[in-house]
């Protein structure tokens, strides 16, 4: 029995420069782990692809806001 369970850490090393149209995005995850080299957002697209993006970019923040609104509207 191992003493502790090792949980893999997801980090972003490169981020996308260009906006992905909002119609293609499904969800996002914030990467804030201090063991990662940079703070990032991982967008999951409707095609199942995961793309790293920079939360300092306007389109990234706006897309997150937009997705938050969609999830709010889905709540009963």
């Amino acid at each position: 029995q191992p003493d502790s369970v090792s949980i893999p850490i997801t980090c972003c090393f490169n981020v996308i420069n260009r906006k992905i149209p909002i119609q293609r995005l499904e969800s996002y995850t914030r990467i804030t782990n201090i063991q990662c080299p940079k703070e990032a957002v991982i967008f999951k697209t409707k095609r199942g692809k995961e793309v790293c993006a920079d939360p300092k970019e306007r389109w990234v923040r706006d897309s997150m806001k937009h997705l938050d609104q969609i999830f709010q509207n889905l709540k009963p």
Epitope: I16, R18, K19, I20, P21, I22, Q23, K49, W59, D62
Partner: antibody, heavy 124, light 107 residues
Framework: QVQLVQSGAEVKKPGASVKVSCKVS????????MHWVRQAPGKGLEWMGG????????IYAQKFQGRVMMTEDTSTDTAFMDLSSLRSEDTAVYYC?????????????????WGQGTTVTVSS | DIQMTQSPSSLSASVGDRVTITCRAS??????LGWYQQKPGKAPKRLIY???SLQSGVPSRFSGSGSGTEFTLTISSLQPEDFATYYC?????????FGPGTKVDIK
């Protein structure tokens, strides 16, 4: 606001190549996804290809595969469309088109800003 | 490839008329559709994005509707500057495809 200015008209012989440029101002090219569309005289609009940010690569319409190359010079914010093995059917107006990143709808798919068009005539 | 068909291919109308143009996709494209207006010798201009959202600066007499495979562009009261050719564009699946166009001219 994003603006696109294209190179001037070209006259080419069959079998030759043409390179059309599209200069971006108001934004940097690396933040935009550029598309190319052509229109033959008296005909409709035809999408030739464009940059897919999701995959980080340029997608070409099957019809032009192997004959077209879309490239970028990020140092001058200029996009290029190179079409080779020209034939008379390639006589058309060629447009570049992209997003207007400063409008309320910028999160959506672009092609809402267009260049003025470049006329390419292929004739022997 | 997704085929886009438009009807009618041309129509004659008078100022003040209500005009409806239909675009059909050969398979579902969700709401990934735009409508463009083109005048002779000019670059296309987008009127509608995401099926029904009005591009900023475009008059409210233009509207779009539909989803899946059938889409409509409506001009509620045709103005002299609206005589042009109209195209739909699907950007759901590569290659992106335009409809063949609908020419609106003066009756």
């Amino acid at each position: 606001q994003v603006q696109l200015v294209q190179s001037g008209a070209e006259v080419k012989k069959p079998g030759a190549s043409v390179k059309v440029s599209c200069k971006v101002s108001g934004y940097t090219l690396t933040e935009l996804s550029m598309h190319w569309v052509r229109q033959a005289p008296g005909k409709g609009l035809e999408w030739m290809g464009g940059f897919d940010p999701e995959d980080g690569e340029t997608i070409y319409a099957q019809k032009f595969q192997g004959r077209v190359m879309m490239t970028e010079d990020t140092s001058t914010d200029t996009a290029f469309m190179d079409l080779s093995s020209l034939r008379s059917e390639d006589t058309a107006v060629y447009y570049c088109a992209t997003d207007d990143m400063l409008t309320p709808h910028y999160l959506y798919f672009g092609m809402d800003v267009w260049g003025q068009g470049t006329t390419v005539t292929v004739s022997s | 490839d997704i085929q886009m068909t438009q009807s009618p291919s041309s129509l004659s109308a008078s100022v003040g008329d209500r005009v409806t143009i239909t675009c059909r996709a050969s398979q579902g494209i969700r709401n990934d559709l735009g409508w463009y207006q083109q005048k002779p010798g000019k670059a296309p201009k987008r009127l509608i994005y995401a099926t029904s959202s009005l591009q900023s600066g475009v008059p409210s007499r233009f509207s779009g509707s539909g989803s899946g495979t059938e889409f409509t562009l409506t001009i509620s009261s045709l103005q002299p500057e609206d005589f042009a050719t109209y195209y739909c564009l699907q950007h759901n699946t590569y290659p992106f495809t335009f409809g063949p166009g609908t020419k609106v001219d003066i009756k």
